[in-house]
Amino acid sequence: AVNGTSQFTCFYNSRANISCVWSQDGALQDTSCQVHAWPDRRRWNQTCELLPVSQASWACNLILGAPDSQKLTTVDIVTLRVLCREGVRWRVMAIQDFKPFENLRLMAPISLQVVHVETHRCNISWEISQASHYFERHLEFEARTLSPGHTWEEAPLLTLKQKQEWICLETLTPDTQYEFQVRVKPLQGEFTTWSPWSQPLAFRTKPAALGKDT
């Protein structure tokens, strides 16, 4: 296993899920592999079966408990092992010590809704899902709005440098269909990364009032 052709990357959602991806060039697609998690100061351990996601990569979710339960803390270290079946025995392919709160990727924000819409502006709110209470207010958000004739990649990013679960979009065009997405990231963690984007919220601005006849 000591070569540059394999990669093992995991993230913690801050509550009760560790998601892992294992990639190995030249590995057989039908190889049976799993991830085993052993925390250094907990009585439980957990296993998940790696399932293929592409030609040379596998993924699985370590479900540590109920979705909103706080299963790990900032002082925990989890030893993660990739094991693959070779005949009747399991072969260890990789061993990684993993500090959960240095490797955070939260769930995508949920419950997006239009609070108020006008001709040129729209107020939208959302909620964070399965996020640890440890963060208190130490979160940031990025948002983007899809305008007609553009792609998501072209949409400018709006950054909210605090825990603010709403936004007021301005300078919109009247009677126009838009879509909106948001993602979240804790401020702590060496390898912490952005959550996936939320499901898009579609909304339409109100038409401009008709001018009086002259």
């Epitope: 296993a1 000591v2 990669q7 010590d97 060496e190 390898f191």
Partner: nanobody, 127 residues
């Protein structure tokens, strides 16, 4: 750039423990990923463990069988290797190494990835 000095090696009976230390001086320790390698007589240098700049991820050689723990203290400019349940096959010179390039802690690095090396400390495990 940093200079590295290992300590903590010695003679230990099989089943015993040792903690190796690697002290860094002369640079910004937290900007380096750190690794441990070992070389037994007549054998090639072998990867043992590597940890990222902040210690958020640490990869271990499968041969360590979960008996070793690598950690770092960026305030003390030191990286450690705690070795438990030692076996005669663990007998080797243990080297500390620093990597100036970015290391994600998601793969097994090669010795050529490391730029700076200590002088090594001898570990002998008797049966």
């Amino acid at each position: 750039q940093v200079q590295l000095q290992e300590s903590g090696g010695g003679l230990v009976q099989a089943g015993g423990s040792l903690r190796l230390s690697c002290a860094a001086s002369g640079g910004t320790f937290s900007s380096y990923a750190m690794g441990w390698f070992r070389q037994a007589p007549g054998k090639e240098r072998e990867f043992v463990a590597a940890t990222t700049r902040g210690g958020g991820r640490t990869m271990y050689a499968v041969s360590t069988e979960g008996r070793f723990t690598c950690s770092r203290d960026n305030d003390k400019n030191t990286v450690y290797l705690l070795m438990n349940s030692l076996k005669p096959k663990d007998t080797a010179v243990y080297y500390c190494a620093a990597m100036t390039s970015y290391y994600s802690g998601t793969y097994y690095p090669d010795s050529s990835d490391f730029d700076i090396w200590g002088q090594g400390t001898q570990v002998t495990v008797s049966s």
